[in-house]
Interface confidence: low
């Protein structure tokens, strides 16, 4: 069957990009740093605005190898701080509780279902 636009708008594509580029501060050359910075800013904005975490959820950052994991110790940041529930100053409500995965202090919903919903309706 013919590929549709929706076929390309898949969680795997987003996941691959996020894992490779999010907070990747050590590319072999800096051409890709330009792109990595853009991806990082986009994901930070998405996670903060939509109160979501990763593509499928916080487990993305634990299940898969990622640039984020290379740059951050698992104990310090099991997932990006943007996955934490924020106060009105855009600071984590309780960073330690967020890191420990205490319900109510981190977002357990993935961003893909939030952004794919509107796309699927067109």
């Amino acid at each position: 069957t013919a590929a549709t636009q929706q076929d390309f708008f898949t969680p795997n594509l987003f996941l691959k990009q996020m894992l490779e580029r999010y907070q990747n501060n050590s590319p072999p050359n800096n051409d890709d740093q330009w792109k990595n910075n853009g991806v990082t800013k986009t994901w930070d904005r998405l996670m903060l605005q939509d109160n979501c975490c990763g593509v499928n959820g916080p487990s993305d950052w634990q299940k898969y190898t990622s640039a984020f994991r290379t740059e951050n110790n698992d104990a310090d940041y099991p997932w990006p701080r943007q996955c934490c529930v924020m106060n009105n100053l855009k600071e984590p409500l309780n960073l330690e509780a967020c890191k420990l995965g205490v319900p109510g202090f981190y977002h357990n919903q993935g961003c893909y279902e939030l952004i794919s919903g509107p796309m699927n309706r067109h």
Epitope: N25, P28, N29, N30, D31, D32, K35
Partner: antibody, heavy 122, light 113 residues
């Protein structure tokens, strides 16, 4: 082997736009950013900007933001740079260049085109 | 933007002599993530295109004679030619490969007596 073949010298009238081409061969065109440099006669090198042939994302030196437009044609493996409203200040040799053997391999520009001399004169 | 300053702007030496030229950047070029200094050296002979000599401050490009050595870290870098040959007559440029825009130094012109 990797080759970057640039278009021939151009004599242009002030104000008339000019487009330079850089045809790549010997590697997969979409795997490496293409960069453009300027060198005025007897002067040093200036980095103009870069373009990712896979998705046409560009990173431009702000100095050249209103002067240079970078594009690619993936199907002919050719990168283009258009200079708008040229003045005598734009008279220079322009080079296209890319990094080492693989897109994630080396720092520095290992491969250069032979250069295109642009002369702006009434 | 990172400003790259090279010195001297020109120097004249006798074949066989040791030569050092300096390159200073206005900001550190050290990537703390991988501990590499994103500083590149190029050689441009008269009428030719620039040629990559050294990347990551000290890694010699394939085919470059071992008389060329790059050193330094952070903001201060040096290119050394241990025994200058007649064919080394050229302008040498350093380049910030750390952040966009990837600025070049003004160059050091090497002349042979």
């Amino acid at each position: 082997q990797v080759q970057l073949q640039q278009s021939g010298p151009q004599l242009v009238r002030p104000g008339a736009s000019v487009k330079i081409s850089c045809k790549a061969s010997g590697y997969s065109f979409t795997t490496s950013w293409m960069h453009w440099m300027k060198q005025r006669p007897g002067q040093g090198l200036e980095w103009i900007g870069m373009i990712d042939p896979s998705d046409s994302e560009t990173g431009l030196n702000q100095i050249f933001r209103d002067k240079a437009t970078l594009t690619v044609d993936k199907y002919s493996s050719t990168a283009y740079m258009q200079l708008s409203s040229p003045t005598s200040e734009d008279s220079a040799v322009y080079y296209c260049a890319r990094r080492g053997r693989f897109s994630y391999d080396y720092g520095g520009f290992a491969y250069w085109g032979q250069g295109t001399l642009v002369t702006v004169s009434a | 933007d990172i400003v790259m300053t090279q010195s001297p702007s020109s120097l004249t030496v006798t074949a066989g002599e040791k030569v050092t030229m300096s390159c200073k950047s206005s900001q550190s070029l050290l990537n703390s993530g991988n501990q590499k200094n994103y500083l590149t050296w190029y050689q441009q002979k008269p009428g030719q295109t620039p040629k990559l000599l050294i990347y990551w401050a000290s890694t010699r490009e394939s085919g470059v004679p071992d008389r060329f050595t790059g050193s330094g870290s952070g903001t201060d870098f040096t290119l050394t030619i241990s025994s200058v040959q007649a064919e080394d007559l050229a302008v040498y440029y350093c380049q910030n490969d750390y952040s966009n825009p990837f600025t070049f130094g003004g160059g050091t012109k090497l002349e042979i007596k």
